[in-house]
């Protein structure tokens, strides 16, 4: 069977530029090592936002300078992207790869449209 990945269609970032969503995958095999990548698609260009490889049952570890954090529970990954601004509004795709043990499987979600609205600056108080 091919691997299916589900993620919400739309998420609104908080006023602090933080967006969270769940990426859930239907694993066809008993993977012990999983790689999760967040991709951003804009104007048909796809770029990598962040990636993490984790052992099942352990925490997701993104690079120290990553704008992503996450936790895993079974076949669910809870992803949080920080530091978002209005210009970062776009389609964020969850990509899941079952790396080990073989066989390798790829799963790509349909994407979550994240809307980011920059907060209005506070008016000067006299």
């Amino acid at each position: 069977k091919a691997m299916h990945v589900a993620q919400p269609a739309v998420v609104l970032a908080s006023s602090r530029g933080i967006a969270s969503f769940v990426c859930e995958y239907a694993s066809p095999g008993k993977a012990t090592e999983v790689r999760v990548t967040v991709l951003r698609q804009a104007d048909s260009q796809v770029t990598e936002v962040c990636a993490a490889t984790y052992m099942m049952g352990n925490e997701l570890t993104f690079l120290d300078d990553s704008i992503c954090t996450g936790t895993s529970s079974g076949n669910q990954v809870n992803l949080t992207i920080q530091g978002l601004r209005a210009m970062d509004t776009g389609l964020y795709i969850c990509k899941v790869e079952l790396m080990y043990p073989p066989p390798y499987y790829l799963g790509i979600g349909n994407g979550t449209q994240i809307y980011v609205i920059d907060p209005e600056p506070c008016p000067d108080s006299d």
Partner: antibody
Framework: EVQLVESGGGVVEPGRSLRLSCAAS????????MHWVRQAPGKGLEWVAV????????DYADSAKGRFTISRDNSKNTLYLQMNSLRAEDTAVYYC???????????WGQGTLVTVSS | EIVLTQSPGTLSLSPGERATLSCRAS??????LAWYQQKPGQAPRPLIY???SRATGIPDRFSGSGSGTDFTLTISRLEPEDFAVYYC?????????FGPGTKVDIK
Amino acid sequence: EVQLVESGGGVVEPGRSLRLSCAASGFTFSSYGMHWVRQAPGKGLEWVAVIWYKPSEKDYADSAKGRFTISRDNSKNTLYLQMNSLRAEDTAVYYCARGGLLGYFDYWGQGTLVTVSS
Amino acid sequence: EIVLTQSPGTLSLSPGERATLSCRASQSINSYLAWYQQKPGQAPRPLIYGVSSRATGIPDRFSGSGSGTDFTLTISRLEPEDFAVYYCQQYGRYPFTFGPGTKVDIK
């Protein structure tokens, strides 16, 4: 600009070895899975091997298992295919290809011809 | 192993005509299907990925459709440069497999 350039092909006798190289440029090499695909003269495309983000994670086609070894040197942005115990049926053009962010093979090298003949 | 079957083996058409190429998988591959074009002496060139998304720089006369196990590549109006061999590929699981190809030649 993404570029993949294969080298190392040539004529070799059955049972001998050959090492192919693929020099990559224009992208962050270590962030991508890299593949070898071959094409026998007048035939279709056959996937040979892949090496993932960790150099220890590899997969091979049945026809390559036990004889071919894929490796990468991220510091040199280079992909390799060590081919041992070569047979006449290994005669083909060997392409390296990048596994794109969305999974399909988005960039290919120009290929290098390997001829196994006595 | 997922086996891909392409039909027809050869398609003889004239420039300006519509080409319809078929690819069938031995089991469901969701949307992890790509199409490549190859001309003699050249490397394959990606045309379509994810069943229906065009790769960078591919003209809109190329389109892909299908789901599950049955997929189609359509070239709405053949241009002289479109006469080539077309391969489908599944990339959703190991081992990655290609179809045997369909040759589109000039009638």
